[in-house]
Interface confidence: low
Amino acid sequence: AGVFELQIHSFGPGPGGAPRSPYSARGPCRLFFRVCLKPGLSEEAAESPCALGAALSARGPVYTEQPEAPAPDLPLPNGLLQVPFRDAWPGTFSLIIETWREELGDQIGGPAWSLLARVTRRRRLAAGGPWAGDIQRAGAWELRFSYRARCELPAVGTACTRLCRPRSASRCGPGLRPCAPLEDECEAPPVCRAGCSLEHGFCEQPGECRCLEGWTGPLCMVPVSTSSCLGLRGPSSTTTGCLVPGPGPCDGNPCANGGSCSETPGSFECTCPRGFYGLRCEVSGVTCADGPCFNGGLCVGGADPDSAYICHCPPGFQGSNCEKRVDRCSLQPCRNGGLCLDLGHALRCRCRAGFAGPRCEHDLNDCAGRACANGGTCVEGGGAHRCSCALGFGGRDCRERADPCAARPCAHGGRCYAHFSGLVCACAPGYMGARCEFPVHPDGVSALPAAPPGLRPGDPQRYP
């Protein structure tokens, strides 16, 4: 057992980030943070529960944003975020920190929450070690924080799996290690040999690396082969002098929290005590009081560890803990080729020319279903359809390449150039304008000290 502690140092715009508050013109608000811990370094499914635990910070001080003021570091809640863990500290874990903004204006139905930033870090961390600092960017925001894991007595060690007992305690009990010579006290964990496995090794003296059952090698990285068990299914332990089973599916009892293991073909099954669940009974009896629902999800049931909780997720989120943002645009709400934009608080459709409405559902002309290629625009006239083609294209459906300068748009000897954003005319001396159609009056005087960047006399008049 132990506690994961997170200290937020600052949250604000990062270097090169939003120079002004992106929430200007809103009323007073305050920040709070959510932390979610998941075991392992693997890319877990986003909706997997916060199996190691979750915590919610207190609300920070009320902050009224100034529309024209630069966004400062925002005022933070006081104190640590603490996530207790009942079982072994896994050493490798995923840390998810969410920064939430609570608007305190006159909201219908109470305060409005919005997620400002989410950072996810996969880390190795030994329990009992010093604070680890980190700086993470999320969009234009920057979050500075420190974290550590510490064991709570009587647990000790880098995984909080060693239990401090009087020296008389058995040396062969499962998972037990003798304490320091001083009666009923635990010594500070020694520094193990560099590279010693956090999961499978431990040390009682600085510089050593001693292996847990089932593992061997100088750094405890090598699983013990079952073929070496020679009928006993295991060699004598080099760490205790006791005979221990070799690595079968239930060896070392993979079931946490007092779960009992039974072997199945090629695997195992845990029967968990009340209040625990999961493949290895690693998920403790989370209740709604633990705040397991992210992103404003509503927790129901789960009043005690024996009853399961259910998270009812707000629009835009899903998963057992509402951790996963729904791709709302995958529902394709925009018709007629409109582009779907998820603005966070709402969806918006950016409509193609000729269409309008919240879902681009209104046809503005009789060109619906008419496809003009290469950026051409369908235009109506007398009930007939036709395409008005973009520069460089022609034909009935704008599928044929055309020389945009073939029409000789530049007057008075100007030279035509096709530019990605249109035609430009390089005018002969004495002429100006989009098509060099205007003679330059001799009274013309420069109003600015320099030509546009890269533009010289005789260069195109229309600089992109």
Partner: antibody
Amino acid sequence: EVQLVQSGAEVKKPGASVKVSCKASGFTFTDYYMHWVRQAPGQSLEWMGLVYPYSGDISYAQKFQGRVTLTVDTSISTAYMELSRLRSDDTAVYYCARQGNYVNNAIDYWGQGTLVTVSS
Amino acid sequence: DIQMTQSPSSLSASVGDRVTITCKASQNVGNIIAWYQQKPGKSPKALIYLASYRYSGVPSRFSGSGSGTDFTLTISSLQPEDVATYFCQQYSDSPYTFGQGTKVEIK
């Protein structure tokens, strides 16, 4: 929001000069040509000339050569049109208008107009 | 200078009618023409550029067509707020020139 705000109405005597201002906002002034167009009472629109604020280049319609002067002050995003040696047939509403600087662009925004009355 | 000749000079139609205004250039201007709407006492408002492209915010009942020397502005279903004078303008060559205008009224 694109806005072109012109100075107020003027009453002038024949032979005098008038200077009308046009303050631009809501867009980058130096990226657009600024045109001046006038409209006599009950008549059509008549193009007078243009100025390109970026470079100060100007072009006048032949009819107004020698009588009209177009200037800009880029520091305050303002264009000016001065018409001298006024005659009674110069009585009109004078408009400033902007035009983007690509081949396809037409005049797209107009000021509200300034009525200049020339009367003895 | 390029002359722009509009017809008719005025017309009266009923709400919902299809209205067509034509503009003829004295020489080929490609599709470099624009159409403007001017309501009484107001400044002109741009409707169409490059002969057939509507500006943002212009109702879809307004459409333009034509190229070379002959151009048309069509109001597919006349509305009371369309009462105005409509001008064509070529911006192909200097000096820019306008048609003399077509005054549209409701019957």
